[in-house]
């Protein structure tokens, strides 16, 4: 009941933590203008990874995409290719945790490899958390870094005189929806590691005892603990451990049910 | 088509008190900024408040901050100036205008003028 | 707030003259989000409220004739009436959109010979 329980924790707290993964990467406002110690403008600035927007005082907001491709900075390229694999890895760890739930029957799958698939979404589940954090985090300190260079143009050139206001940029909204949303995700990936492990032990408490009263180790153990063995054999004996060291390349070439986020 | 038109300005003494109003029809009132600006009789203009859609928001410049109060009824399509201790130098033609795109005054009422003097 | 200077205070023209007037700020009205000027400029003719000719510096507001043009970028402005007409006669503002209090110039006024 724990297991099940922890595991369907897991996948809605990703489910939630996917979703504001998505709506992060979405969102415009990554970076708003800093209006602090700022001469009062009627224009608000704010951008996002696919856009910029004003919003005039008069109500009307404008909003432009970036249509280059090459123009763009390089860490802004970076940041959306981090929020897109982490958008991607949460797909998919979705899709594999939902055939992944214990409450949930499909045919005769064994729990062997319900908890397979449980481990593997959860991993992709940590990893997707992991690029959106990493996506934001590179943007926030990309902003940092801007901002306090803007800062120190800002008071230079004509004796104090400003002739031109350089409009500095500080966190918006959409970070603090990514650190959280990435977060979550990482904390439902750990649910659903946690939970696999859960599977695991009427599984190989029965297993145990067939293998001391039969002798058959070999039969028993079809892969045992090798990392290598990843998902290839399905049969009721096989110890659910099997992914533990589980290599990347099985990882992705088998679907996981914790890839939603 | 857009129609503003502004009542309430009269006659009053330094230190009184005014308030005036502008009714708005042919746009939707509830989508707009709008503002108060006044016309000195030396042709000179100068906003005197503005306030966005919704009300949530409000601007005065320092010359009548905290003597007038802009608000609006968006059920009644109603700008309003609420104008107190009023000066000589608040003597002026009033007009109501609505924001439009580039923070730009695209419609403007035909005013209402506001004379303070003993 | 802002300083808006207006140039010339006032000028005569005779009917289908090219007419320039200047508008300068004391910032720049340039807003890097958008890459447009927060100059405006309207029309007040006789007796009338102002009217709103162009915005960003040079859209023209729908109605007005395409004899007038907006131009210029940052702290230097300039509205060009083509070639000026009998019902031109009015004084032209222009307006800081970018900085509160919005403040105008304190005009240019068109008479025709």
């Known amino acids: 009941m724990a297991v099940t329980a922890c595991q369907g924790l897991g996948f809605v707290v990703s489910l939630i933590g996917i979703a504001g993964i998505i709506a992060a990467t979405c969102m415009d406002q990554w970076s708003t203008q800093d209006l602090y110690n700022n001469p009062v403008t009627a224009v608000f600035n704010y951008q996002g990874l696919w856009r910029s927007c004003v919003r005039e005082s008069s109500g009307f907001t404008e909003c432009r995409g970036y249509f280059t491709l090459l123009g763009l900075p390089a860490m802004l390229q970076a940041v959306r290719a981090l929020m897109i694999v982490g958008i991607v890895l949460g797909a998919i760890g979705l899709l594999v945790s939902i055939f992944a739930l214990k409450c949930i029957r499909i045919g005769s799958m064994e729990d062997s490899a319900k908890a397979n698939m449980t481990l593997t979404s959860g991993i992709m589940f940590i990893v997707s958390g992991l690029c959106a954090i990493a996506g934001v985090s590179v943007f926030a300190n990309m902003l940092v870094t801007n901002f306090w260079m803007s800062t120190a143009n800002m008071y230079t050139g004509m004796g104090g005189m400003v002739q031109t206001v350089q409009t500095r940029y500080t966190f918006g909204a959409a970070l603090f929806v990514g650190w959280v949303a990435g977060g979550l995700t990482l904390i439902g990936g750990v649910m659903m590691c946690i939970a696999c492990r859960g599977l695991a032990p009427e599984e190989t408490n029965y297993k145990a005892v067939s293998y001391h009263a039969s002798g058959h180790s070999v039969a028993y153990k079809p892969g045992g603990f090798k990392a290598s063995t990843g998902f290839g054999s399905n049969t009721k004996n096989k110890k659910i451990y099997d992914g533990g060291a589980r290599t990347e390349d099985e990882v992705q070439s088998y679907p996981s049910k914790h890839d939603y986020v | 088509e857009v129609q503003l038109v502004e009542s309430g300005g009269g006659l009053v003494q330094p230190g009184g008190s005014l308030k005036l109003s502008c009714a708005a029809s042919?746009?939707?009132?509830?989508?707009?900024?709008m503002s108060w600006v006044r016309q000195t009789p030396d042709k000179r203009l100068e906003l005197v408040a503005t306030i966005n859609s919704n009300g949530g928001s409000t601007y005065y410049p320092d010359s009548v901050k905290g003597r007038f109060t802009i608000s609006r009824d968006n059920a009644k399509n109603t700008l309003y100036l609420q104008m107190s201790s009023l000066k000589s130098e608040d003597t002026a033609m009033y007009y109501c205008a609505r924001l439009s795109y580039g923070n730009s005054f695209a419609n403007w009422g035909q005013g209402t003028l506001v004379t303070v003097s003993s | 707030d802002i300083q808006i200077t207006q140039s010339p205070s006032s000028l005569t023209v005779t009917a289908g003259e090219k007419v320039t007037m200047s508008c300068q700020s004391s910032?720049?009205?340039?807003?890097?989000?958008?890459?447009?000027?927060?100059l405006t400029w309207y029309q007040q003719k006789p007796g009338q409220p102002p009217k709103l000719l162009m915005y960003?510096?040079?859209t023209r507001e729908s109605g007005v004739p395409d004899r007038f043009a907006g131009s210029g970028s940052g702290t230097d402005f300039t509205l060009t009436i083509s070639s000026v007409q009998a019902e031109d006669l009015a004084i032209y503002y222009c307006q800081n959109t970018y900085y509160y209090p919005f403040t105008f110039g304190s005009g240019t006024k068109l008479e025709i010979k």
């Open positions: 960003w510096a040079s």
């Open positions: 042919g746009f939707t009132f509830s989508s707009y900024g």
């Open positions: 910032q720049s009205l340039l807003n890097s989000g958008n890459h447009r000027n927060y």
